[in-house]
């Protein structure tokens, strides 16, 4: 009391930083700095982030929280995890859709839109890889179908149908009926 030398940061604990005159304890994640501490090694005045805002880390200097991002409905995005005081909204794609990055060097923060996954069944193909981070990978034609151009064509039900070589190889057993 009554002295004039402000102490350096030799406070107990490691989460102190000099803010103005004094070494202050920072604010926990999910809280913003209302006012720095007013005495050596003191606690700063920290308030909880208001609704629809967040701060993910402990901090000494944030006097406001960051706004939670809104998922882009135009890009068919949905919220996989809602925003909380300590974490931003996690946007992604609903089941049956996959992420298509809008930039070539794709990272987690890159802008993206959601594309509907290919339905291999509707294309009469086997599903080789399920759709999640990328589009469905379809395989060969389902039984009863043969490769024709880019698609799978149903085997003819009678010998009346024309059956090219590939058809005959796959559907040959049907020719007996």
């Amino acid at each position: 009391q009554g002295g004039t030398r402000s102490p350096r940061c030799d406070c107990a604990g490691d989460f102190h930083k000099k803010i103005g005159l004094f070494c202050c304890r920072g604010c926990p994640a999910g809280h913003y700095l209302k006012a720095p501490c007013t005495e050596p090694c003191g606690n700063s005045t920290c308030l909880v982030c208001p609704q629809d805002t967040f701060l993910a880390w402990e901090n000494h200097h944030n006097s406001e929280c960051a706004r939670c991002q809104a998922c882009d409905e135009q890009a068919s995005q949905v919220a996989l995890e809602n925003c909380s005081a300590v974490a931003d909204t996690r946007c992604g794609c609903k089941p049956g859709w996959f992420v298509e990055c809008q930039v070539s060097q794709c990272v987690s923060s890159s802008p993206f839109y959601c594309q509907p996954c290919l339905d291999c069944g509707a294309l009469h193909r086997h599903t080789r890889l399920l759709c999640s981070r990328r589009d469905t990978d379809c395989g060969t034609c389902l039984p009863g179908f043969y490769e024709h151009g880019d698609g799978c064509v149903s085997c003819p039900t009678s010998t009346l149908g024309s059956c090219p070589e590939r058809c005959a190889a796959v559907c040959g057993w049907r020719q007996m009926f």
Epitope: K34, T38, G42
Partner: antibody, heavy 116, light 107 residues
Framework: EVQLVESGGGSVQPGGSLRLSCAAS????????MNWIRQAPGKGLEWITY????????YYADSVKGRFTISRDNAKNSLYLQMNSLRAEDTAVYYC?????????WGQGTLVTVSS | DIVMTQSPSSLSASVGDRVTITCQAS??????LSWYQQKPGKAPKLLIN???NLETGVPSRFSGSGSGTDFTFTISSLQPEDIATYYC?????????FGQGTRLEIK
């Protein structure tokens, strides 16, 4: 809107006493450190004392140590400066200011004249 | 105590001029430095904190730089309303100390 309003200034004889007040409004007074800064006529600014938000820590410039006492009443949102053994060189406009480093908000000041 | 030496003590400039004021600390104060503007008969007003952070609402023609012992305050294009006395202030250590001030006048 943050407001700081000083009062209690006036004329006093050398050796006399005076008590200055600073009424605070527009912010959570109990969360902030407070200061008194003075400015002699035609001169620069001189920080003289600081008090922590709880009142538990006080600091003084050597020029006023032992003669001036800073205090606060958080229930009344008020800051005080008790000035004893006043000298001619204490003549100045006295400002209260908020902050524990940069002084973000200042009052308009109150003039203290020490003269025989 | 940390001594803050401000220069020049006064200066005269024309509207539109670039104005620079320097402040030197007698020891390293990191970036714990503020700049204030004081108009006659008024209380000082905080313009810049932490050596370079502009306070909210302060025009962008004001700027600050420096770290350690040498600091600079700049008005990029002087306006008539900038006529005032400017002070630097260190808050690295108690007692808090101010520079002696720079009186700025219009030519």
């Amino acid at each position: 809107e943050v407001q700081l309003v000083e009062s209690g200034g006036g004329s006093v004889q050398p050796g006399g006493s005076l008590r200055l007040s600073c009424a605070a409004s527009g912010f959570t007074f109990s969360s902030y450190g407070m200061n008194w800064i003075r400015q002699a006529p035609g001169k620069g600014l001189e920080w003289i004392t600081y008090i922590s938000s709880s009142g538990g820590h006080t600091y003084y410039a050597d020029s006023v140590k032992g003669r001036f006492t800073i205090s606060r009443d958080n229930a009344k949102n008020s800051l005080y400066l008790q000035m004893n053994s006043l000298r001619a060189e204490d003549t100045a406009v006295y400002y209260c200011a908020r902050g524990q480093g940069p002084f973000e908000y200042w009052g308009q000041g109150t003039l203290v004249t020490v003269s025989s | 105590d940390i001594v803050m030496t401000q220069s020049p003590s006064s200066l005269s400039a024309s509207v539109g001029d670039r104005v620079t004021i320097t402040c030197q600390a007698s020891q390293d104060i990191s970036n714990y430095l503020s700049w204030y503007q004081q108009k006659p008969g008024k209380a000082p007003k905080l313009l810049i904190n932490d050596a370079s952070n502009l306070e909210t609402g302060v025009p962008s023609r004001f700027s600050g730089s420096g770290s350690g012992t040498d600091f600079t305050f700049t008005i990029s294009s002087l306006q008539p309303e900038d006529i005032a006395t400017y002070y630097c202030q260190q808050y690295d250590n108690l007692p808090i100390t101010f520079g002696q001030g720079t009186r700025l006048e219009i030519k």
